[in-house]
């Protein structure tokens, strides 16, 4: 229904009416409608709504709505439904982000590998290397660094030391009778026990082998398939690597601080192979890279000399 | 009230150039737009182009420009067409109307050798 | 160019009839039109604007219609001072166009 009434709030345009040549001033539409009838000497103008699927989202003194954005591209989905007063709006759905005219799945960050940034709609995750201290065990898009499980707050030792990619395996001390205790300085073989790992303080003992100075740092030794990292962030998407080739392990050796040869201690050295068993697995996780720059938005802006 | 008062009759060689003037009384002249519109004998009536006084903005029919010039004196009230370059196709009864309302009384402009 | 399509380009009438004449545009116009009647030898006098508006001065004898796109000019009961030519005149966009005109004869 055309509506005529007159805001004191609402702006201004210029208008000619070209049947007379007069320049005239009219009110502006409210946004949602547009001037379907211009002012004259004798009358104000005349608004009517936006028909379905065109828009106006300012007052304006214009002639015909916009039209809205095309039905959003699969995958997208629509953020802002097409509305008198707004333009359809496309969005990627969760888990993915715009990257050029599409969406594009998260990268998802590999074991030994956590979220630095989280992804949102319009950019991508940011791993980054588990930290001394910290694991990751699954590939994802979501999940941080964890600490490892603090076996001795819990009463326990540690009887496999953590990885960039496993927990600490904590184990029980078994009880000794006054006479059958171990003489000083022999290691002695615990009760392993997984724990379920807790956001706790890690313990301090330092695993060898895979990287001597562990950290973020650009000079620390890198699975191959991460080796274009810079600053702790996973590949470009459009390198050769997609994560195929194998993420190589250096298992840690375990070693014990005291070196006297007791039989105790022969008898760890000979379990460790099969508690390490597990360690050397490959990783085939696709890893994908940040884009560079903004998206590309659906940018269906429209300027007239009338609106705004 | 309003009026357009036109200039009197041209007789020009070809090649030549004609200035028309119209006299707009009764109104703000620097208020509103004026148009000039040719009408030739059995050719129907074509649009020129207008001016707007109140800046001296002129918006031209493709098909004019480079052949005419719309002017205007603000202190007189009037509007001037030039006509350039002259021929026998430019003979018609030219007119200036405010908007398509208010018109003047034309015109006529004769090219002949 | 929008195309002003006239019709009838002549038509024979007898005093007190009721008379259309149609203009079809080219493109859709609104209500952008305006309608001229021009007597032999004279200048043009505004008849209607706006596609309804009648202009002062002039007889409610004469009416517009239409919008978008078909427009018609109607006379009704036609008196001796209105045998003449009508035009409609197309000013939504440049270059404004013209009908071809409408000879009113009386019969």
């Known amino acids: 229904q055309p509506e005529q009434k007159a805001s004191n709030l609402i702006g201004t345009y210029r208008h000619v009416d070209r049947a007379t040549g007069q320049v005239l001033t009219c009110d502006k539409c409210p946004a949602g409608t547009y001037v379907s009838e211009h002012c004259t000497n004798t009358s104000l103008r005349v608004c009517s709504s936006c028909p379905v699927g065109t828009f106006t989202r300012h007052e304006n003194g214009i002639e015909k709505c916009h039209d809205c954005s095309q039905p959003c591209p699969w995958p997208m989905i629509e953020k802002l439904p097409c509305a008198a007063l707004t333009d359809r709006e496309c969005t990627c759905p969760p888990g993915m982000f715009q990257s050029n005219a599409t969406c594009a799945p998260h990268t998802v960050c590999p074991v030994g590998w956590g979220v630095r940034k989280k992804g949102t709609e319009t950019e991508d995750v940011r791993c980054k290397q588990c930290a001394r201290g910290t694991f990751s065990d699954v590939p994802s898009s979501v999940m941080k660094c964890k600490a490892y499980t603090d076996c001795l707050s819990q009463n326990l030792v540690v009887i496999k030391p953590g990885t960039k990619e496993t927990d600490n395996v904590c184990g029980t001390l078994p009880s000794f009778s006054s006479s059958t205790s171990p003489s000083p300085g022999t290691a002695i073989f615990p009760r392993p026990e997984h724990m379920e790992t807790h956001e706790v303080p890690s313990s301090t003992y330092v695993p060898k082998g895979m990287n001597s100075t562990e950290s973020n740092s650009s000079a620390s030794v890198r699975p191959k398939v991460l080796s274009s990292i810079q600053e702790g962030t996973v590949p470009d998407n459009t390198s050769s690597a997609r994560g195929k080739e194998d993420v190589n392990k250096t298992l840690p050796n375990l070693q014990v601080v005291n070196h006297q040869q007791g039989p105790h201690h022969r008898h760890i050295l000979k379990l460790l192979p099969s508690m390490e068993a597990t360690g050397g697995e490959k990783s085939s996780t696709p890893i994908k890279g940040p884009k560079r720059g903004h998206p590309r938005q659906n940018l269906h802006k429209h300027f007239d000399i009338n609106e705004h | 009230q309003v009026q357009l008062q036109q200039s009197g009759p041209e007789v020009a060689r070809p090649g030549a150039s004609v200035k028309l003037s119209c006299k707009a009384s009764?109104?703000?002249?620097?208020?509103?737009?004026l148009n000039w519109v040719k009408q030739r004998t059995g050719q129907g009536l074509e649009w020129i182009g207008e001016i707007y006084p109140g800046n001296n903005h002129t918006y031209y029919n493709e098909k004019f420009k480079g052949k005419a010039t719309l002017t205007a004196d603000n202190s007189s009230s009037t509007a001037y067409l030039q006509f350039s370059s002259l021929t026998s196709e430019d003979s018609a009864v030219y007119f200036c109307?405010?908007?398509?309302?208010?018109w003047g009384q034309g015109t006529l402009v004769t090219v002949s050798v | 160019d929008i195309l002003m399509t006239q019709s009838p380009s002549s038509m024979s009438v007898s005093l007190g009839d009721t008379v259309s004449i149609t203009c079809h545009a080219s493109q859709g116009i609104r209500n952008s039109i305006g309608w001229l009647q021009q007597k032999p030898g004279k200048s043009f006098k505004g008849l209607i604007y706006?596609?309804?508006t009648l202009e002062d001065g002039v007889p409610s004898r004469f009416t517009g219609s239409g919008s978008g796109a078909d427009f018609s000019l109607t006379i009704s009961s036609l008196e001796s001072e209105d045998f003449a030519d009508y035009y409609c005149?197309?000013?939504?966009?440049?270059?404004?166009?013209f009908g071809g005109g409408t000879k009113l004869e009386i019969k």
């Open positions: 005149v197309q000013y939504a966009q440049f270059p404004y166009t």
């Open positions: 706006h596609a309804t």
């Open positions: 009764g109104y703000t002249f620097t208020d509103y737009y």
């Open positions: 109307t405010r908007g398509v309302i208010k």
